[in-house]
């Protein structure tokens, strides 16, 4: 029950964090004029990953795209193209982790295939997460950086062009949907891979070997119990430990995926 | 078309208040912005105050406080409450249309006159 | 607050000749967000409110003659009637569009020679 839970819990946290990173994505706010220290403006700019936009105190809103590709930085490619591999990578990742979740049945697939399809949709949440955070804080960084420059321009007077304010730029909202989102997506795929570790424990079985012993008989069997998280029971535990004797035949578990011998 | 109508001007005390009203027609307060804009006897345009669609309000900082921009939308009708007048009040009071796009006043009423004088 | 000056205060120009009005900010009216310009040009004639001409710096504005032309980037700017007729006699202002409070020049009358 606690493996379905948590596994649920981490498709749903996770399916949060990338709706978030495709929201930060797709937002114009990733940078915002800073009206800090300047005068009252009626125009106010700012920018996204895609275009730049400009609201006057009117209401009216015009917003160009940035048609050009090879005119833009590189760290703002770099940024769109973390943001895109998050948003495929995660994606991928819910298609996977739909599939692999305990409660949806598909056919007579086994835990053993629900579990590895929820440690990859896991790993991938995780890389998905890493990528929004990473994208996020590059922009930022760029943001802090030019904010600190076109500061130092401004008291410099531009090379004598004193009458020319530079227009600041600082963090929007979409950085703070970014890093949160990111960081869901990451929690989310931390998650399903503690839930994989319910799904699938690992086990090791060996040939049973039976010690009689006088009075009650015990059949021991080496890795008998498979190495179990503490999430939910497992059905497929069975006691070892039993008041009759037995045959090797008769004590040797079914068989699994997981019997390597 | 578009028409704006102010009234409420006329001969007032230095220290007395008074409020001017901007009735408008062919268009609605919701979707433009519109200005208050004086002119003294002889002198050239100070722009007062404005009140945007979304109700939001920008004022002349030159005037301390003393002057309130209002609408009601309902009534089609901006309001000027002028309080602690002065004898540099004195002026031709016009409110105008904000045109939308690039902050232009693009309609302009025929103006009420205030004359603070004791 | 921005400052706007015009010059010159008074100009008188024959019938079918070119006017200059110049304005100057005091603080750059170009947006970098949209390289716009945020001023504005109206004309007032005697006893009657301001008429919009130009807005944006060089736009102009529906039903204003194409002989009024404005332009001009940053903090300097022109409106220029280039023939002028009996009915442009009138007093000039430019306006700060970009920065409240959106003050007006000081004004630049237009005569005829």
């Known amino acids: 029950m606690a493996v379905t839970a948590c596994q649920g819990l981490g498709f749903v946290v996770s399916l949060i964090g990338i709706a978030g990173i495709i929201a930060a994505t797709c937002m114009d706010q990733w940078s915002t004029q800073d009206l800090y220290n300047n005068p009252v403006t009626a125009v106010f700019n700012y920018q996204g990953l895609w275009r730049s936009c400009v609201r006057e105190s009117s209401g009216f809103t015009e917003c160009r795209g940035y048609f050009t590709l090879l005119g833009l930085p590189a760290m703002l490619q770099a940024v769109r193209a973390l943001m895109i591999v998050g948003i495929v990578l995660g994606a991928i990742g819910l298609l996977v982790s739909i599939f692999a979740l305990k409660c949806i049945r598909i056919g007579s697939m086994e835990d053993s295939a629900k579990a590895n399809m929820t440690l990859t949709s896991g790993i991938m949440f995780i890389v998905s997460g890493l990528c929004a955070i990473a994208g996020v804080s590059v922009f930022a960084n760029m943001l802090v950086t030019n904010f600190w420059m076109s500061t130092a321009n401004m008291y410099t007077g531009m090379g004598g062009m004193v009458q020319t304010v530079q227009t600041r730029y600082t963090f929007g909202a979409a950085l703070f949907v970014g890093w949160v989102a990111g960081g869901l997506t990451l929690i989310g795929g931390v998650m399903m891979c503690i839930a994989c570790r319910g799904l699938a424990p690992e086990e090791t079985n060996y040939k049973a070997v039976s010690y009689h012993a006088s009075g009650h008989s015990v059949a021991y069997k080496p890795g008998g119990f498979k190495a179990s998280t503490g999430f939910g029971s497992n059905t497929k535990n069975k006691k070892i430990y039993d008041g009759g004797a037995r045959t090797e035949d008769e004590v040797q578990s079914y068989p699994s995926k997981h019997d390597y011998v | 078309q578009v028409q704006l109508v102010e009234s409420g001007g006329g001969v007032v005390q230095p220290g007395r208040s008074l409020r001017l009203s901007c009735t408008v027609s062919g268009f609605t307060l919701t979707s433009y912005g519109v200005y208050w804009v004086r002119q003294a006897p002889g002198k050239g345009l100070e722009w007062v105050a404005v009140v945007w669609a979304g109700g939001n309000t920008n004022y002349n900082s030159a005037l301390k406080g003393r002057f309130t921009i209002s609408k009601d939308n309902s009534k089609s009708t901006l309001y000027l409450q002028m309080n602690s007048l002065r004898a540099e009040d004195t002026a031709v009071y016009y409110c105008?249309?904000?045109?939308?796009?690039?902050?232009?006043?693009?309609?302009w009423g025929q103006g009420t006159l205030v004359t603070v004088s004791s | 607050d921005i400052v706007m000056t015009q010059s010159p205060d008074s100009l008188a120009v024959s019938l079918g000749e070119r006017a200059t009005i110049n304005c100057k900010s005091s603080q750059s009216l170009l947006n970098s967000g949209n390289q716009k310009n945020y001023l504005a040009w109206y004309q007032q004639k005697p006893g009657q409110p301001p008429k919009l001409l130009i807005y944006?710096?060089?736009t102009r504005e529906s039903g204003v003659p194409d002989r009024f032309t404005g332009s001009g980037s940053g903090t300097d700017f022109t409106l220029t009637i280039s023939s002028l007729q009996a009915e442009d006699v009138a007093v000039y202002y430019c306006q700060n569009d970009h920065f409240f409070p959106f003050t007006f020049g000081q004004g630049t009358k237009v005569e005829i020679k």
């Open positions: 944006g710096a060089s």
């Open positions: 105008a249309r904000d045109r939308g796009r690039l902050l232009a006043m693009d309609y």
